[in-house]
C-alpha cells in the first residue's frame, strides 16, 4: 500500500540535492584556500540535520545552528553588497570586484543558491515531489528559514558603508516584503553601519529618469534614517557600462556618469 504523502503547493526538492550540496562545498573549498579546512561531509550532515525527519512547516533558526557553526567565515564587514530582485548583476559585479561580497559569495550562500529542499515529519526521506510555498502553505519552511537566518546574520555583520543593488525596472524598486526589505534592512546595526548606499539599476537604454526620487526609495530612506543610519542613492543608468568600468576603471569613457 503506497504511503500517503503531503502535497505542498511549491516545487519539490531540487533533483540530486545531496550530491549538489556536497559538490558545491568541495568546489567552494577548492576555490577559497581559507576554507580548505572545511569538512564537506560534516557540512552536508549538518545541512541534512536541519530539515530531515522534521515537519517542513515547523523549521526554526535553531535547526540551522549546527550548519552555521561549520560555515564560520571571515567577511570584511565594510565590503558587503546586498541586493534585491537583481541577483545576476550583483553576482557579476562581485565576480569582477573581488573584494566585495554578496551572501552567495559566502560558503553558506553558495551552497543553497537557487536550490529547494524539504523533508517529511518522522521519515528520513527527502521530498522530491513538493515543498511548502511561503505564501500558500507556511513561512517556516526549510528554504525560507535558511535564507532568513543567513540574511539576518549577514546584515548584522555589515559595517561602515553598506551597498545595496536594487532593480529599477520593477514597480516596487524597494519592496518591504523582499528579504532585503523585511530582514536585512532591519538587522543592519546602527552602531556599526554609517551609511546605506542604494544603487538603482536602470533597465531601459533611454531611461534618464532619476529613480532615486521614486516613492519606494523615499520609503527606504525613511526606514533607514529612523534607524540612525545615513542613506545615499545613485542611479546606474547603464549597467553594461557600469560593469565594464568596474573591469577597466581607467577607460576614458568611465569618467562620465554611468
Amino acid at each position: 500500500v503506497p504511503r500517503w504523502r503531503q502535497q505542498w503547493s511549491g516545487p519539490g526538492t531540487t533533483k540530486r540535492f545531496p550530491e549538489t550540496v556536497l559538490a558545491r562545498c568541495v568546489k567552494y573549498t577548492e576555490i577559497h584556500p581559507e576554507m580548505r579546512h572545511v569538512d564537506c561531509q560534516s557540512v552536508w550532515d549538518a545541512f541534512k540535520g536541519a530539515f530531515i525527519s522534521k515537519h517542513p512547516c515547523n523549521i526554526t533558526e535553531e535547526d540551522y545552528q549546527p550548519l552555521m557553526k561549520l560555515g564560520t567565515q571571515t567577511v570584511p564587514c565594510n565590503k558587503i553588497l546586498l541586493w534585491s530582485r537583481i541577483k545576476d548583476l550583483a553576482h557579476q559585479f562581485t565576480q569582477v570586484q573581488r573584494d566585495m561580497f554578496t551572501l552567495e559569495d559566502t560558503l553558506l550562500g553558495y551552497l543553497a543558491d537557487d536550490l529547494t529542499w524539504c523533508g517529511e515529519f518522522n521519515t528520513s526521506k527527502i521530498n522530491y515531489q513538493s515543498c511548502p510555498d511561503w505564501r500558500k502553505d507556511c513561512s517556516n519552511n526549510p528554504v525560507s528559514v535558511f535564507w532568513k537566518t543567513v540574511s539576518r546574520r549577514f546584515a548584522e555583520a555589515a559595517c561602515d558603508v553598506v551597498h545595496v543593488m536594487l532593480n529599477g525596472s520593477r514597480s516596487k524598486i524597494f519592496d518591504k516584503n523582499s528579504t532585503f526589505g523585511s530582514v536585512e534592512v532591519h538587522n543592519l546595526q546602527p552602531e556599526k553601519v554609517q551609511t546605506l548606499e542604494a544603487w538603482v539599476i536602470h533597465g531601459g537604454r533611454e531611461d534618464s529618469r532619476d529613480l532615486c526620487q521614486d516613492p519606494t526609495i523615499k520609503e527606504l530612506e525613511s526606514i533607514i534614517s529612523k534607524r540612525n543610519i545615513q542613506f545615499s542613492c545613485k542611479n546606474i543608468y547603464r549597467p553594461d557600462k557600469f560593469l565594464q568600468c568596474v573591469k577597466n576603471p581607467e577607460d576614458s569613457s568611465c569618467t562620465s556618469e554611468i
Partner: nanobody, 117 residues
C-alpha cells in the same frame, strides 16, 4: 566603530589553563552578542563560543564544550574566555568579535595560545 583588544595568551603545557580577555570600545557593549573565534596555524577560522548581550544565551563548539567557559562583564566592557584542560589542538590565535557568526570580521590583533610540553 567597533574596537577590540585581546590579551591573556601565552605558552602553556597540556592540561593547563589560561584566561583570555577582550577589552571592547566604540559601541554599546551590552547591546551586542560576542564571540571567540580562533585560527590555528595553516588552518581556517573556527568558531569557539558565543554569548548574548545579557549573557542569557551561551553556546560552545563541541571541541571545547566542558573545558572552556565564556563570560562577560558589561560594566567593564570586557569579554572573557576561561580555558581549562588545554590540548595541543587548542593552539591558535584567538580573536574576539561582535555577533554570533557565521560571518566575522575580527578587528583585534588576536592573542596567541600555544599548548606544548
Amino acid at each position: 566603530e567597533v574596537q577590540v583588544l585581546e590579551s591573556g595568551g601565552g605558552l602553556v603545557q597540556p592540561g593547563g589553563s589560561l584566561r583570555l580577555s577582550c577589552a571592547a570600545a566604540g559601541f554599546t557593549f551590552s547591546n551586542f552578542a560576542m564571540s571567540w573565534v580562533r585560527q590555528a596555524p595553516g588552518k581556517g577560522l573556527e568558531w569557539v563560543s558565543s554569548i548574548s548581550g545579557s549573557a542569557g544565551t551561551i553556546d560552545y563548539a563541541d571541541s571545547v564544550k566542558g573545558r572552556f567557559t565564556i563570560s562577560r562583564d558589561n560594566s567593564k566592557n570586557t569579554l572573557y574566555l576561561q580555558m581549562n584542560s588545554l590540548r595541543a589542538e587548542d593552539t591558535a590565535v584567538y580573536y574576539c568579535a561582535d555577533g554570533t557568526g557565521p560571518f566575522f570580521d575580527y578587528r583585534g590583533q588576536g592573542t596567541l595560545v600555544t599548548v606544548s610540553s
